[in-house]
C-alpha cells in the first residue's frame, strides 16, 4: 500500500492490501477504498468497463465474469488497484474472440484466466491441428496470451487457449486470426495504354490497375501541373488472400483540345509510392501526313525495277488508299501495311513496286489517302533513260 | 545476450530433496520465458518445468507434475526448481534455458535460444 507523505496527495489505499485476491465463485468481494477524497471505483476486464461511486465495492456472489482490475481513483487524479481472479472451475477463460494481428507486429489472444494457479496456459489449434513451428507466445493470466511477431502465414490460423486441470487440458472457445498484411513493396501500377490521340468530342477513357497485398493502398488520378480533381471510378477484387487489386478508371466524356496533357496515376502505401502516365492528345480534327522515304523526282534506266515509298501518319485511320499512273488505279504492285501492331498506331507505309521499266512508263505516280475527315497525295516524278 | 548459470546440483538419496537455481545476467530483462530441461545418459533432452517471467504461468509435462515446482524470484533474476520424492530414474544433467518469448511447443528444446552449461543432479538408490 502506498505511504503518505505530508502536504502532498497520495493514492488512495485499498482493502485488502494485495495486489491480487483469488476468490471463489459464490463468494463474496468486499474491496474498501479509502481516500479522503474518493472519486469512483471502475472495474475493467476485457473491453467492459463498469463504475461505482461508493467507496466500498461489495459483490455478494461472485461469477467468473467478476475477475478483472478494480481501480479506485481519488480527487487528485490518483489510483490505485487491485486485480480479483473469481476461481470457476466451470469457467476457466474470459474470452474476446476478436483477433486480428498486424504482420510483424504482436497481437494479444484475449483469453485472461478467472484461476491464475492453473498450469500450462498456453495455445493449442484447432481440432488437434498443429500450430505452425515458429509461433512465439507470451502468456498472461490477466490479459490473455501475446502470439509474438504475427507472421503472413498465420492469417485463418484457428487457435484455443489452453490449460491444464487436475491433469486434463481445457480449451477455451476458438479464435481465428485475421492477419493485416504488412507493405513490404510499393504498389504494382499498370495503365490500359500508353497514349491516346482523339479527335475533339470523342470520349477519353483510361484504366489504372493497381495491385497490392491490401486494399488500403492509396491510389488516384491527377493531372500534371494541375490540382484539379478528376472524376475517377474504382472497381476492385480481392484474388484470394494479401492479392488486391483495383481499377481506377478516368473518363473525360467529351475531350477539348485543352484537355491534352499528361495523365498520371499515382499509388502509395507506407512502404512507397509508385506511379505510371498516360498521354492524351486531342486534336480539333483528323489529320493525314505524308513523308516521301525516297526521292520525289527519280532517275531510272530502261528494264531496271524502282520502289516508291511512302510513310504516313494517319489520324483516325486510313480507309481508302490507292496509287495512280494516268489517271488509271493499281490494282497490284503495291501493298500498305501499318508500321507497328501497337493498337495506338498511327504511321503506315505504302510501297508501289515499279518492274522493268520501259521508257514509255515515265511520268508522275501519285499516292492518295483518305479517313473520314480528310485527303492527302503525294507525287513522283519517274524518268525512264 | 543473456548468461544463464545453474547451481544446487549433486548427490541424493532417493526420496530425498534438492532445489536448483538458475541466475539470469546481461539483457534479461527481454526473456520472458524460463525453462528446465534435463537429460540423462544416452537419452533425448526432456522437459522438465518453465515459467513464464512477467505473467508468473508455469508449464509441466504430466510426468513431472507435482513432484516438481518452477518458481521465480526477479529481484534476484534467478528461476528455481524444486525437486520432491526424487527417484533413481531422475539422475541427468539439468539445464536452464530461456528466450524471449515461449514457442507454441514449449516442451521443444530445439526451440530456446538460450542455454546454461548444466548441473548433475544424481539419485542413489
Known amino acids: 500500500q502506498p505511504s503518505v507523505s505530508p502536504g502532498e496527495p497520495s493514492p488512495p489505499s485499498i482493502h485488502p492490501g494485495k495486489s491480487d485476491l483469488i476468490v471463489r465463485v459464490g463468494d463474496e468481494i468486499r474491496l474498501l477504498c479509502t481516500d479522503p477524497g474518493f472519486v469512483k471505483w471502475t472495474f475493467e476486464i476485457l473491453d467492459e468497463t463498469n463504475e461505482n461511486k461508493q467507496n466500498e465495492w461489495i459483490t455478494e456472489k461472485a461469477e467468473a465474469t467478476n475477475t478483472g482490475k478494480y481501480t479506485c481513483t481519488n480527487k487528485h487524479g490518483l489510483s490505485n488497484s487491485i486485480y480479483v481472479f473469481v476461481r470457476d472451475p466451470a469457467k476457466l477463460f474470459l474470452v474476446d474472440r476478436s483477433l486480428y494481428g498486424k504482420e510483424d507486429n504482436d497481437t494479444l489472444v484475449r483469453c485472461p484466466l478467472t484461476d491464475p494457479e492453473v498450469t500450462n496456459y498456453s495455445l493449442k489449434g484447432c481440432q488437434g491441428k498443429p500450430l505452425p513451428k515458429d509461433l512465439r507466445f507470451i502468456p498472461d493470466p490477466k490479459a490473455g496470451i501475446m502470439i509474438k511477431s504475427v507472421k503472413r502465414a498465420y492469417h485463418r490460423l484457428c487457435l484455443h487457449c489452453s490449460v491444464d486441470q487436475e491433469g486434463k487440458s481445457v480449451l477455451s472457445e476458438k479464435f481465428i486470426l485475421k492477419v493485416r498484411p504488412a507493405f513490404k513493396a510499393v504498389p504494382v501500377v499498370s495503365v490500359s495504354k500508353a497514349s491516346y490521340l482523339l479527335r475533339e468530342g470523342e470520349e477519353f477513357t483510361v484504366t489504372c490497375t493497381i495491385k497490392d497485398v491490401s486494399s488500403s493502398v492509396y491510389s488516384t488520378w491527377k493531372r500534371e501541373n494541375s490540382q484539379t480533381k478528376l472524376q475517377e471510378k474504382y472497381n476492385s477484387w480481392h484474388h484470394g488472400d494479401f492479392n488486391y487489386e483495383r481499377q481506377a478508371t478516368l473518363t473525360i466524356s467529351s475531350a477539348r483540345v485543352n484537355d491534352s496533357g499528361v495523365f498520371m496515376c499515382y499509388a502509395n502505401n507506407t512502404f512507397g509510392s509508385a506511379n505510371v502516365t498516360t498521354t492524351l492528345e486531342v486534336v480539333d480534327k483528323g489529320f493525314i501526313n505524308i513523308f516521301p522515304m525516297i526521292n520525289t523526282t527519280v532517275f531510272v534506266n530502261d528494264g531496271e525495277n524502282v520502289d516508291l515509298i511512302v510513310e504516313y501518319e494517319a489520324f483516325p485511320k486510313p480507309e481508302h488508299q490507292q496509287w495512280i499512273y494516268m489517271n488509271r488505279t493499281f490494282t497490284d504492285k503495291w501493298e500498305d501495311y501499318p508500321k507497328s501492331e501497337n493498337e495506338s498506331n498511327i504511321r503506315y507505309v505504302s510501297e508501289l513496286h515499279l518492274t522493268r521499266l520501259k521508257g514509255t512508263e515515265g511520268g508522275t505516280y501519285t499516292f492518295l489517302v483518305s479517313n473520314s475527315d480528310v485527303n492527302a497525295a503525294i507525287a513522283f516524278n519517274v524518268y525512264v533513260n | 545476450e543473456v548468461q544463464l548459470v545453474e547451481s544446487g546440483g549433486g548427490l541424493v538419496r532417493a526420496g530425498g530433496s534438492l532445489r536448483l537455481s538458475c541466475a539470469a545476467s546481461?539483457?534479461?530483462?527481454?526473456?520472458?520465458?524460463r525453462a528446465w530441461f534435463r537429460q540423462a545418459p544416452g537419452k533425448e533432452r526432456e522437459f522438465v518445468a518453465a515459467?513464464?517471467?512477467?505473467?508468473?504461468?508455469?508449464y509441466y509435462p504430466n510426468s513431472m507434475k507435482g513432484r516438481f515446482t518452477i518458481s521465480r524470484d526477479n529481484a534476484k533474476n534467478t528461476v528455481y526448481l524444486q525437486m520432491n520424492s526424487l527417484k533413481p530414474e531422475d539422475t541427468a544433467v539439468y539445464y536452464c534455458?530461456?528466450?524471449?518469448?515461449?514457442?507454441?511447443?514449449?516442451?521443444?528444446?530445439?526451440?530456446?535460444?538460450?542455454w546454461g552449461q548444466g548441473t548433475l543432479v544424481t539419485v542413489s538408490s
Open positions: 546481461g539483457r534479461t530483462f527481454t526473456y520472458d520465458a
Open positions: 534455458a530461456a528466450d524471449e518469448s515461449f514457442p507454441a511447443y514449449y516442451s521443444d528444446y530445439a526451440l530456446y535460444r538460450y
Open positions: 515459467i513464464s517471467w512477467s505473467g508468473g504461468s508455469t
